[in-house]
């Protein structure tokens, strides 16, 4: 799930580097005036954005919420990076929780992978080697992830 | 936030004609360009047109210049896709999209968007 919003509350300040646009378009870490005649720099830690565009407005930073942690703080042309914390992982399928890792393997299988906050422990069975994948049990915790525009895959 | 609804697509014969909408639900689509992207059964998703809603200058992917012609309506907050001489290749879902992005400033094509309506599906068929 991806929390981008160019908000409409939001003037910008005063002290805010202005520039003028190129071909009509600001670079990254601004956004454009609604007369288009100006490029207006994002607010560091509030705002960003990551491509040349014409934004009214930049893009709201991404707060990690609890059960994640912060890996990259937001700057004005990068989203803040969450990851899940320790013991907990997010899977390609469902990035919008963090799931709880297992603790260990079925009986006849032995872990030939830990928990990282991309995927679950792996288990193999002794015998013939093969994978087990099993249910795993969500954690009650939405959690964001960063951009998911085409072009901007930030975790 | 930005909201994009789109309408207008449907079942048409080859040579046939289309005109499809975007409306903005809330105050602002959020950015001075709107486009159009496409997306084939089993294909990317890919570029089709984009307008300036402040002086209206229009840009076409080569593939529907001479056929589609954007517009847009600011007082109705609404942008329009007129698809004539339509192929059974412009078969696909068509995508409105705002807070366009690009790698670099002169190019006409944009990488990406933040905002997408949830698509129409155009099918041109005989």
């Known amino acids: 799930i991806t929390r981008q919003s160019l908000d409409p509350q939001r003037r910008a300040a005063p002290q805010q580097k202005r520039s003028s646009p190129t071909e009509g378009l600001c670079p990254p870490g601004h956004h454009i005036s609604e007369d288009s005649r100006e490029c207006i720099s994002c607010k560091y830690g509030q705002d960003y954005s990551t491509h040349w565009n014409d934004f009214l407005f930049c893009l709201r930073c991404t707060k990690c919420d609890s059960g994640e942690v912060e890996v990259n703080s937001c700057t004005t042309t990068r989203n803040t990076v969450c990851q899940c914390e320790e013991g907990t992982f997010r899977e390609e399928d469902s990035p919008e929780i963090c799931r709880k890792c297992r603790t260990g393997c079925p009986r006849g299988m032995v872990k030939v992978k830990d928990c990282t906050p991309w995927s679950d422990i792996e288990c193999v069975h002794k015998e013939s080697g093969t994978k087990h994948t099993g249910e795993v049990p969500a954690v009650e915790k939405t959690v964001t992830t960063s951009p998911g525009t085409p072009a901007s895959p930030c975790s | 936030e930005v909201q994009l609804l789109e309408s207008g697509g449907g079942l048409v014969q080859p040579g046939g004609s289309l005109r499809l909408s975007c409306a903005a639900s809330?105050?602002?689509?959020?950015?001075?360009?709107v486009g159009w992207f496409r997306q084939a059964p089993g294909k990317g998703r890919e570029f089709v047109s984009a307008?300036?809603?402040?002086?209206?200058?229009?840009y076409y992917a080569d593939s529907v210049k001479g056929r589609f012609t954007i517009s847009r309506d600011n007082s109705k907050n609404t942008v329009y896709l007129q698809m004539n001489s339509l192929r059974p290749e412009d078969t696909a879902v068509y995508y409105c999209?705002?807070?366009?992005?690009?790698?670099?400033?002169?190019?006409?094509?944009?990488?990406?968007?933040?905002?997408w309506g949830q698509g129409t599906l155009v099918t041109v068929s005989s």
């Open positions: 999209a705002a807070g366009l992005q690009y790698n670099r400033a002169a190019d006409r094509v944009p990488v990406g968007a933040v905002y």
């Open positions: 809330g105050r602002t689509f959020g950015s001075i360009r």
């Open positions: 307008i300036n809603r402040n002086d209206g200058t229009t």
